[in-house]
Interface confidence: medium
Amino acid sequence: AGLKLMGAPVKLTVSQGQPVKLNCSVEGMEEPDIQWVKDGAVVQNLDQLYIPVSEQHWIGFLSLKSVERSDAGRYWCQVEDGGETEISQPVWLTVEGVPFFTVEPKDLAVPPNAPFQLSCEAVGPPEPVTIVWWRGTTKIGGPAPSPSVLNVTGVTQSTMFSCEAHNLKGLASSRTATVHLQLVPRGSSAHHHHHHHHSAWSHPQFEK
């Protein structure tokens, strides 16, 4: 069986949430049982599509209703003919979407006015991904390339932070991290060094 992917580009880029049909042309064989393979594993997908072009020419489709990042990979199709498996050329499927967070800011407990760091990282495709930091509803830094570390000089009350990741497909917002104040024992040196009526918030540095 001469097996080839029909008309499809070797690299296929699809937006997240969109449908896609990968197609595979089998010539020189009647009624082939076409199996699709992704990254070396047979795709168990009953919901496929077939078109008989002629007696010895079939087109098989792998129909994905709504692609997500996990659908990205290398696909090919195969048929068995006389005990031998014929394998097609692969299609590389890339799934593009809004950025996906690999690191999000975590909740912290810090002493009043103590410096701390928050981290944020997001990936595409598409790249590049840039990060913007928010303190509550106020934008406090960015845009800067992902990954990003926010250096905060200190807070005097519980404060919420989040990051926003941008790429050509749009933006995604991270979880909101709450930075709580650690209770400081009355007799501690920390208590004597800090005046509770003085706001120690200074505009944080924003670094990659």
Partner: antibody
Framework: EVQLVQSGADVKKPGASLTISCQAS????????ISWVRQKPGKGLEWMGR????????YYGPSFQGHVTISADRSTATAYLQWRSLEASDTAMYYC??????????????????WGPGTLVTVSS | SYELTQPPSVSVSPGQTARITCSGD??????AYWYQQKSGQAPVLVIY???KRASGIPERFSGSSSGTMATLTISGAQVEDEADYYC???????????FGGGTKLTVL
């Protein structure tokens, strides 16, 4: 005209073996798939499994895996559903279905357009 | 194992719009199909691939899908539409089919 002729009703005792058949005509057998669907008396439809056009690929629902075997004979255009050991809970109507319908987009296997009349299997001691 | 959930029954008056829902975690990724079964008969395909009407099915039947919910809508239900309706889809891994429990549509 597409026709699926199923074997007649059968009464068996628990533990007995049974094979029911579904003979297709009016189309090229190897252009389509065959699925089997169970319907217990007064109950809903249950997908049992499907066999590919060549018979080289079979899929089974989790409730039926290991309990039934689906096979096909291309030379006689017949699909089979087989039990090695029947249970009382197997009492039901069994439909064979030609899986695959021609649509504007092509042939879709899950397009169950042609159904057999059903075979009633009763398992009782 | 994977399940599709349907309401057991829906009742409408003739001419009204009937909506039958089907929920399943994989429906954002897998197509829904709808089958009609009248008493004592084999099922008939009504809708395939979420919203496409099967051949010979009247225009009053339509389908839609959003998130984990698929919906069969019968606009202007008629007495002859009284039947059991089953949604069908495929497991998240794509390796077996599943019917919903069925919805008995009564057109009073």
């Amino acid at each position: 005209e597409v026709q699926l002729v199923q074997s007649g009703a059968d009464v068996k005792k628990p533990g007995a073996s049974l094979t029911i058949s579904c003979q297709a005509s009016g189309y090229t057998f190897t252009d389509y798939w065959i699925s089997w669907v169970r319907q217990k008396p007064g109950k809903g439809l249950e997908w049992m499994g499907r066999i590919s056009r060549h018979g080289s690929q079979t899929y089974y629902g989790p409730s039926f895996q290991g309990h039934v075997t689906i096979s096909a004979d291309r030379s006689t255009a017949t699909a089979y559903l087989q039990w090695r050991s029947l249970e009382a809970s197997d009492t039901a109507m069994y439909y064979c279905v030609r899986a695959g319908g021609q649509t504007s987009g092509g042939t879709i296997p899950e397009y169950y357009q042609h159904w057999g009349p059903g075979t009633l299997v009763t398992v009782s001691s | 194992s994977y399940e599709l959930t349907q309401p057991p029954s829906v009742s409408v008056s003739p001419g009204q719009t009937a909506r039958i829902t089907c929920s399943g975690d994989a429906l954002p990724k897998k197509y829904a199909y709808w089958y009609q079964q009248k008493s004592g008969q084999a099922p008939v395909l009504v809708i395939y691939e979420d919203h496409k009407r099967a051949s010979g099915i009247p225009e009053r039947f339509s389908g839609s899908s959003s998130g984990t919910m698929a919906t069969l809508t019968i606009s202007g239900a008629q007495v002859e539409d009284e039947a059991d309706y089953y949604c069908y889809s495929i497991s998240p891994a794509g390796n077996y089919g599943v019917f919903g429990g069925g919805t008995k549509l009564t057109v009073l």
